[in-house]
Amino acid sequence: EAIQVTQPSVVLASSHGVASFPCEYSPSHNTDEVRVTVLRQTNDQMTEVCATTFTEKNTVGFLDYPFCSGTFNESRVNLTIQGLRAVDTGLYLCKVELMYPPPYFVGMGNGTQIYVIDPEPCPDSD
């Protein structure tokens, strides 16, 4: 059973390689357990970047992932990916699964294109 997941189409990472974007879903029923997965699409392949399960008591996620963090509030997840470099530029998709109570609902956003520009190295100063 499907839910609609929305995320911004484009985000520019900061000069420190940090990109933040929201991932929202609807409809939202009273949900005890929400699983959020960030996937990166390259060509026809999807690779998992990070995943976490949010609950009423656990609203801060991705504790097992050094490059991801996120907070959960009602039907919105604020995602942050750090440590990004130019080679990480690509399409990042947010997948949301409503795990409890049933029925199971799942939805995938259209993706956020994250652009990462490596900072210019500082010129040596004599």
Partner: antibody, heavy 117, light 107 residues
């Protein structure tokens, strides 16, 4: 039309085993939790176990933990309750039920398990 | 495990009476509580889910409410077909539990 049909009940000796089946139809089986609930003669409802195939999750009442195993075959839309080391106090009508949100909205007709020598 | 303490265990009432049954959870279960009606030899029927939502096809004289860990089933005007046994159930994540049941009998 949503339907749950239990089968597999019967008379078994103490220490014996029995496997109950719950055949589901009329809904997407894999999107729901299935529960087993029992009722001893003249007594109240007792929750036994639950399973979610999509979440790969099972849970049991303390009274049956280690003796009963709940499982599901999504290709057959069927949930099972394997009951081992049966005792006289396991004698009851066993119901399977579907959980939707915070309630069991569809129940089977029940199957009677009698544990006696 | 979370315990559900249901009261009273039985009550006698007349047609037209207002009937209240209470369940107290031993710890917080949010709104994860359901109420059922059961008649002899039959499977239970869902009346209220998510503490206060009326299940489809259930008469509006049935209602559910929550105050902290206390959950209440109210029948506003008892009808002849309402004489039965009523159970609460908590369905928060983890093992589920039922209340002991309340038998509603004719006075």
């Amino acid at each position: 039309e949503v339907q749950l049909v239990e089968s597999g009940g019967g008379l078994v000796q103490p220490g014996g085993s029995l496997r109950l089946s719950c055949a589901a139809s009329g809904f997407t089986f894999s999107s729901y939790y299935i529960h087993w609930v029992r009722q001893a003669p003249g007594k109240g409802l007792e929750w036994v176990a639950s399973i979610s195939s999509y979440a790969d999750y099972t849970d049991y009442a303390d009274s049956v933990k280690g003796r009963f195993t709940i499982s599901a075959d999504t290709s057959k839309n069927t949930a099972y309750l394997q009951m081992n080391s049966l005792r006289a106090e396991d004698t009851a009508v066993y119901y399977c039920a579907r959980q939707s949100y915070y309630g069991l909205d569809y129940w089977g007709q029940g199957t009677l398990v009698t544990v006696s020598s | 495990d979370i315990q559900m303490t249901q009261s009273p265990s039985s009550l006698s009432a007349s047609v037209g009476d207002r009937v209240t049954i209470t369940c107290r959870a031993s710890q917080s279960v949010s709104s994860a509580v359901a109420w059922y009606q059961q008649k002899p030899g039959k499977a239970p029927k869902l009346l209220i889910y998510s503490a206060s939502s009326l299940y489809s096809g259930v008469p509006s004289r049935f209602s559910g409410s929550r105050s902290g860990t206390d959950f209440t089933l109210t029948i506003s005007s008892l009808q002849p077909e309402d004489f039965a046994t009523y159970y609460c159930q908590q369905l928060s994540r983890g093992p589920s539990t039922f209340g002991q049941g309340t038998k509603v009998e004719i006075k």
